[in-house]
């Protein structure tokens, strides 16, 4: 019961996390900035992975997509890639985990198969969460780096004087959504991996080896295993079978009608 609950909870937490990663990737508010020191209008700028938007005090908003790939910073491309990889892995993980859920019966799927699928989806969720956290962290680092690099330096360009206006870009809502979502996906993945251990069928206490009767007079007894473990009725420690421990020469001895495989 605890295993089913852990698996189910891991699935739900991961589902919420991946939904959050998708939401964060689509959001425009990765970085936000107020440009109030303008004589024309108060301008609020916010940027996402796919477009940059400007909202004026009048309420007018203009968004422009990043249509060119060549002019974009490599870091932005890396963040995009990390988020997309995270979404793809998470989506595949969700698909796998649906079939792995203990409460859902599909044909005659064995517990070992469900355990493997649960582990696979758990690992996928962990990697997905790490991708999202890494992507958001890289973007946040890019904002911090850009701020410290833009300390009001002035230089003369081809078209006249260019002045970098020092205004702090703050972390947008998408960054926090991404961090939380990545964390949830990671936690969900760990829960799936924990659930996998409980789903795996317990290993038998004996190994599947061939047992040979020691002689023609002693037949294989079903109670032999009990006797060997000290719980049977073999009080005199009479050798019922020798546990299959033989040398190479002994193994190649003549077969008898009492050999069992």
């Amino acid at each position: 019961m605890a295993v089913t609950a852990c698996q189910g909870l891991g699935f739900v937490v991961s589902l919420i996390g991946i939904a959050g990663i998708i939401a964060a990737t689509c959001m425009d508010q990765w970085s936000t900035q107020d440009l109030y020191n303008n004589p024309v209008t108060a301008v609020f700028n916010y940027q996402g992975l796919w477009r940059s938007c400007v909202r004026e005090s009048s309420g007018f908003t203009e968004c422009r997509g990043y249509f060119t790939l060549l002019g974009l910073p490599a870091m932005l491309q890396a963040v995009r890639a990390l988020m997309i990889v995270g979404i793809v892995l998470g989506a595949i993980g969700l698909l796998v985990s649906i079939f792995a859920l203990k409460c859902i019966r599909i044909g005659s799927m064995e517990d070992s198969a469900k355990a493997n699928m649960t582990l696979t989806s758990g690992i996928m969720f962990i990697v997905s969460g790490l991708c999202a956290i890494a992507g958001v962290s890289v973007f946040a680092n890019m904002l911090v780096t850009n701020f410290w690099m833009s300390t009001a330096n002035m230089y003369t360009g081809m078209g006249g004087m260019v002045q970098t206006v020092q205004t702090r870009y703050t972390f947008g809502a998408a960054l926090f959504v991404g961090w939380v979502a990545g964390g949830l996906t990671l936690i969900g993945g760990v829960m799936m991996c924990i659930a996998c251990r409980g789903l795996a069928p317990e290993e038998t206490n004996y190994k599947a080896v061939s047992y040979h009767a020691s002689g023609h007079s002693v037949a294989y007894k079903p109670g032999g295993f009990k006797a060997s473990t000290g719980f049977g009725s073999n009080t005199k420690n009479k050798k019922i079978y020798d546990g299959g421990a033989r040398t190479e020469d002994e193994v190649q001895s003549y077969p008898s009608k009492h050999d069992y495989v």
Partner: nanobody, 119 residues
Framework: QVQLQESGGGLVQPGGSLRLSCAAS????????MGWYRQAPGKQRELVAG???????NYGDSVKGRFTISRDNAKNTVYLQMNSLKPEDTAVYYC??????????????WGQGTLVTVS
């Protein structure tokens, strides 16, 4: 890098008209505000007119009712239509744009200036 190309300046008689234009080119995301400033000899630089992407305008007190600013967002170009020009309008007119230049960075770019002489 962002470049500004100004044009339209020259010599004009009092009461005449001129149309200045300024085109921004280069790699950038948005230009929230475009505008014109002027600097007469021995005076400080002052705002003539500014316009936002949404069409919000702001004019300097000395030019209200005479000058009209407009912009073409698709071409990233700003225009200044100057009517009823006076000798005191003589100055170097500078194009000024606020550019969202990248992720978490923006620039205030100034043109090299175009001379308008009213005489």
């Amino acid at each position: 890098q962002v470049q500004l190309q100004e044009s339209g300046g020259g010599l004009v008689q009092p009461g005449g008209s001129l149309r200045l234009s300024c085109a921004a080119s280069g790699t950038f995301f948005n230009i929230p505000v475009m505008g014109w400033y002027r600097q007469a000899p021995g005076k400080q630089r002052e705002l003539v007119a500014g316009i936002s992407t949404g069409g919000t305008t702001n004019y300097g007190d000395s030019v209200k009712g005479r000058f009209t600013i407009s912009r073409d967002n698709a071409k990233n170009t700003v225009y200044l239509q100057m009517n009823s020009l006076k000798p005191e309008d003589t100055a170097v007119y500078y194009c000024n744009v606020l550019v969202i230049s990248g992720i978490g960075s923006h620039l205030e770019v100034w043109g090299q200036g175009t001379l308008v002489t009213v005489s």
